[in-house]
């Protein structure tokens, strides 16, 4: 001789976010007469998910027709599952009572776990640009995933980084989780074309990790090197002086020529040439009329790059001496030119 049992055959059910969860429940008898209700959680704070007797539960459908005589299948389907639906669901048999139905027996519960994909990782770098040899921090964030287990890796140009710290929040049980990681990257002069990649692997991604990228071109500033040289005579009374601005990034650059400390001309880099490593070169010419000068002339090429303090390089032009090529000797790469006469 037995009384009714409520059987929930599945101890746990795992469902992907957006899908439908089936929670199975059968009773072993038609008696005692009374409705079945489904709850999430136990105790006084439990949440009603479905009531056979009354109420509107738009996301819930019954697996079988509960109006059929002798129906003892009280399984339900919950549609469009989100991580917020995770929890333990109890199928509870009530018996008819006056004035209210009385809870008679509960199933053992089915734990619904929701597999939710992490959001696309968002990588952000420092607010201000930094120069080579400096260490900068990149952060990577991804949200809304479940279960909690997740793997995050950092790469720079395909090479895995090791200097990073990662946190998954919250620490305790939650419907979904977030990951936050900070990686330290040492910049080099060759990093204009470099990429920092944050890679997130999760059970929901079926071996196809999500990646977030940051281009170091947004982070790096490569200061230029300057070389001022005097070119061969073009005419008896003219000397051509060039300022070669090499290996700079980004392109934003303003050049000022000074003759004996006085501004002669200011120009903005326009027709630059790009090097293989992504940096730029630019060349500015200054045509000096020697006959206009009685004394030696100090020519200064002053460059303000990307809003930074100006750097300069000078060249002494001897008026008395027969003009000849002189100046610093750093090798030039591809150069652009700019010609201007000064009278």
């Amino acid at each position: 001789e037995e009384e009714l049992q409520v059987i929930q055959p599945d101890k746990s059910v795992l469902v992907a976010a957006g899908e439908t969860a089936t929670l199975r429940c059968t009773a072993t008898s038609l008696i005692p007469v009374g409705p079945i209700q489904w709850f999430r959680g136990a105790g006084p704070g439990r949440e009603l998910i479905y009531n056979q007797k009354e109420g509107h539960f738009p996301r819930v459908t019954t697996v079988s027709d509960l109006t059929k005589r002798n129906n003892m299948d009280f399984s339900i389907r919950i549609g469009n599952i989100t991580p917020a639906d995770a929890g333990t669901y109890y199928c509870v048999k009530f018996r008819k009572g006056s004035p209210d139905d009385v809870e008679f027996k509960s199933g053992a519960g089915t734990e619904l776990s929701v597999r939710a994909k992490p959001s696309a990782p968002v990588v952000s770098g420092p607010a201000a640009r930094a120069t080579p040899q400096h260490t900068v921090s990149f952060t990577c964030e991804s949200h809304g995933f479940s279960p909690r287990d997740i793997t995050l890796k950092w790469f720079k140009n395909g090479n895995e980084l090791s200097d990073f710290q990662t946190n998954v929040d919250p620490v305790g049980e939650s419907v979904s989780y977030s990951i936050h990681s900070t990686a330290k990257v040492v910049l080099t002069r060759e990093d204009v074309h470099s990429q920092v990649i944050c890679e997130v692997a999760h059970v929901t991604l079926q071996g196809d990790p999500l990646r977030g990228t940051a281009n170091l071109s947004e982070t790096i500033r490569v200061p230029p090197t300057l070389e001022v040289t005097q070119q061969p005579v073009r005419a008896e009374n003219q000397v051509n002086v060039t300022c070669q601005v090499r290996k700079f990034y980004p392109q934003r650059l303003q050049l000022t020529w000074l003759e004996n400390g006085n501004v002669s001309r200011t120009e903005t880099a326009s027709t630059v040439t790009e090097n293989k490593d992504g940096t730029y070169n630019w060349m500015s010419w200054l045509l000096v009329n020697v006959s206009a000068h009685r004394d030696d002339v100090k020519l200064t090429c002053q460059v303000e790059h990307d809003g930074q303090p100006a750097v300069s390089k000078s060249h002494d032009l001897k008026v008395s001496a027969h003009p000849k090529e002189q100046g610093s000797n750093t090798a030039a790469e591809n150069t652009g030119s700019n010609e201007r006469n000064i009278y």
């Epitope: 009714l4 008898s29 007469v33 005589r69 139905d101």
Partner: antibody, heavy 120, light 108 residues
Framework: QVQLQQSGPELVKPGASVKMSCKAS????????LSWVKQRTGQGLEWIGE????????YYNEKFKGKATLTADKSSNTAYIQLTSLTSEDSAVYFC?????????????WGQGTLLTVSA | ENVLTQSPEKMAVSLGQKVTMTCSAS???????LHWYQQKSGASPKPLIH???NLASGVPARFSGSGSGTSYSLTISSVEAEDAATYYC?????????FGGGTNLEIK
């Protein structure tokens, strides 16, 4: 048509046990809940409990727990009530009854009753 | 349990008279869960009205029922000799199923 045929009258001594039967016909026995109702002479009706023969599960009025045991035999379409430790208070007519339907709640069909007399 | 109290316990009426008996519940009963039976001496109860006002099969139209909540009644519009019996109300709103103490109708 639905019929519930109950066993004949019983005369038993105090302290003894008795088992009375209710044979169902005219419907699928295992699909319907059967109840047992007690009526003492000149008194009202008291619901004892019910049995669902489909899974041989029972539900009792608290007042009759320990006194009555309901069973069923699907092969013979018969329900039984066993009463133990009998006293004169158990002397009554015992009816089996079936609801019109599972969710009807009214006894559409009744057996003719079995008179139980407990006497030394 | 939901106690059903019937009144009067006994009544004696003349043929053709209108009769009303009441059934009062200690807890509210859904109208679909209140039923009436007729029991003649030495016989089993016979279903009379189910769900407050629905006549069971073969029951004459002179019988009617009404009520809601905790108060229900059974009316016989014009009593006939065959109506002499005890009438019981029964609730199916909550366990245990209970019956009223009965109203015994005697024909004068």
């Amino acid at each position: 048509q639905v019929q519930l045929q109950q066993s004949g009258p019983e005369l038993v001594k105090p302290g003894a046990s008795v088992k009375m039967s209710c044979k169902a016909s005219g419907y699928t026995f295992s699909e319907y809940v059967l109840s047992w109702v007690k009526q003492r002479t000149g008194q009202g009706l008291e619901w004892i409990g019910e049995i669902y023969p489909g899974t041989i599960t029972t539900y009792y009025n608290e007042k009759f727990k320990g006194k009555a045991t309901l069973t069923a035999d699907k092969s013979s379409n018969t329900a039984y009530i066993q009463l133990t430790s009998l006293t004169s208070e158990d002397s009554a007519v015992y009816f089996c009854g079936r609801f019109y339907d599972y969710d009807g709640g009214w006894f559409a069909y009744w057996g003719q009753g079995t008179l139980l007399t407990v006497s030394a | 349990e939901n106690v059903l109290t019937q009144s009067p316990e006994k009544m004696a009426v003349s043929l053709g008279q209108k009769v009303t008996m009441t059934c009062s519940a200690s807890s509210s009963v859904s109208s679909s869960d209140l039923h009436w039976y007729q029991q003649k001496s030495g016989a089993s109860p016979k279903p009379l009205i189910h769900g407050t006002s629905n006549l069971a099969s073969g029951v004459p139209a002179r019988f009617s029922g009404s009520g809601s909540g905790t108060s229900y009644s059974l009316t016989i519009s014009s009593v006939e000799a065959e109506d002499a019996a005890t009438y019981y109300c029964q609730q199916w709103s909550g366990y245990p199923w209970t019956f009223g103490g009965g109203t015994n109708l005697e024909i004068k």
